[in-house]
């Protein structure tokens, strides 16, 4: 994804352990725009800065995720960090986008591969086929070899997902296409869930 995600991650990584805890607690009670769902408490409290950034972007997308992070940081009295995000927001042109209403009245979710990260890590068995489909177009040679070096399917998928935060939508779509080819019934099962 883009600059907004990186800015959110930078801000969260600048928080102390206690501040990150406080950030999560405030995230559980902050007023959300109509049409957006809340990150489940149980999952939220376990997350480190990277996981939380991914979750913010997948639940709220970059524009609103950035705005929400700013709101919580201001509420915590961390004005300087919030201002840094404000600068990113203005530079990326996210202001106009964030001001619009969400498309449906149901809770917003992220890309399919973000939503089903845990299930995909647990249930994808033909990882090499997926890797071959992504090799060159999405994964560099080094990334491809790093994933293949892992011993179990789960470890391979976990390693593959460590690269996902830097991917744009077309990269995530490429992974989804590969999964639809190699694990169609898994994708259909997850779609129903």
């Amino acid at each position: 994804m883009g600059r907004a995600r990186d800015a959110i991650l930078d801000a969260l990584e600048n928080l102390s352990g206690d501040e990150l805890k406080k950030f999560k607690m405030k995230l559980l009670t902050v007023q959300l725009r109509e049409g957006y769902g809340r990150i489940p408490r149980g999952a939220l409290l376990q997350m480190d800065a990277i996981d939380l950034t991914d979750k913010l972007v997948s639940y709220y997308l970059e524009s609103y995720g950035l705005e929400l992070t700013m709101t919580v940081l201001r509420d915590m009295g961390l004005q300087e960090l919030a201002e840094q995000l404000q600068t990113t927001k203005e530079e990326s042109g996210a202001v106009a986008a964030a001001a619009s209403v969400p498309a449906q009245s149901t809770a917003r979710t992220g890309h399919f591969v973000d939503q089903h990260r845990q299930a995909l890590i647990a249930r994808v068995t033909e990882v090499d086929g997926v890797l071959d489909a992504l090799h060159g177009s999405v994964l560099t040679e080094g990334q491809y070899q790093a994933v293949r070096a892992e011993t179990t399917s789960q470890d391979k998928m976990r390693k593959l997902f460590s690269f996902v935060p830097s991917w744009n939508l077309t990269c995530k779509d490429s992974l989804l296409q590969a999964l639809k080819e190699i694990h169609p019934y898994l994708v259909m099962d997850l779609e129903q869930s």
Partner: antibody
Framework: QVQLQQSDAELVKPGASVKISCKVS????????IHWMKQRPEQGLAWIGY????????NYNDKFRGKATLTADISSSTAYMHLNSLTSEDSAVYFC???????????????WGQGTTLTVSS | DIQMNQSPSSLSASLGDTITITCHAS??????LNWYQQKPGNIPKLLIY???KLHTGVSSSFSGSGSGTGFTLTISSLQPEDIGTYYC?????????FGGGTKLEIK
């Protein structure tokens, strides 16, 4: 409600280029990809590609790679398709369209622009 | 690219009839298939997604079935407003491809 408003019909000469616009309302442009379709008279629909304004990435049908360039301007909530080196084969109705939901395992197009008729003639 | 073959290319039926349009994919597309209706001079309208799911606001006289490579769109109790061209579209893989269309007319 979600709306996609396309620019008016264009009449251009062979060899020229054209930029068709698709202004969205009722949702944030960065929340969904915008896909483009081509329809020639008495022919079916062809998928040109999509652009995701949320991160600027695009995916093209190989048949239209080099012919079409997809962009977006977030500040005006507008997606664009630039078509170059136009010939009579490019004369068609072009539609912008948006998948109905984000996060599904595949796309189904529930929202369409009204179409822009492009005529390439000398 | 996945080829989508639709048949018949045109169809004439009487009011009240039940008609069936078929779509055949050149390879397995599971259930990733959509059906659209396009009335003359109008934009395509989504009818069915995921092979059999009726899109919001679409009349229950439309139904879809099939998986893998063979799919059907059925219109029961044909009405005057059902005239138009019907297209199938696969969403299994890029580039997305459409069937050639079935033009439906009323006798």
């Amino acid at each position: 409600q979600v709306q996609l408003q396309q620019s008016d019909a264009e009449l251009v000469k062979p060899g020229a280029s054209v930029k068709i616009s698709c202004k969205v309302s009722g949702y944030a442009l960065t929340d969904h990809s915008i896909h483009w379709m081509k329809q020639r008279p008495e022919q079916g629909l062809a998928w040109i590609g999509y652009m995701y304004p949320g991160d600027g990435s695009a995916n093209y049908n190989d048949k239209f790679r080099g012919k079409a360039t997809l962009t977006a301007d977030i500040s005006s909530s507008t997606a664009y398709m630039h078509l170059n080196s136009l010939t009579s084969e490019d004369s068609a109705v072009y539609f912008c369209t948006r998948p109905y939901s984000f996060g599904s395992s595949y796309d189904y197009f529930g929202y369409w622009g009204q179409g822009t008729t492009l005529t390439v003639s000398s | 690219d996945i080829q989508m073959n639709q048949s018949p290319s045109s169809l004439s039926a009487s009011l009240g009839d039940t008609i069936t349009i078929t779509c055949h994919a050149s390879q397995n597309i599971n259930v990733w298939l959509n059906w659209y209706q396009q009335k003359p001079g109008n934009i395509p309208k989504l009818l069915i997604y995921k092979a059999s799911k009726l899109h919001t606001g679409v009349s229950s006289s439309f139904s879809g079935s099939g998986s893998g490579t063979g799919f059907t769109l059925t219109i029961s109790s044909l009405q005057p407003e059902d005239i138009g061209t019907y297209y199938c579209q696969q969403g299994q893989s890029y580039p997305y491809t459409f069937g050639g269309g079935t033009k439906l007319e009323i006798k």
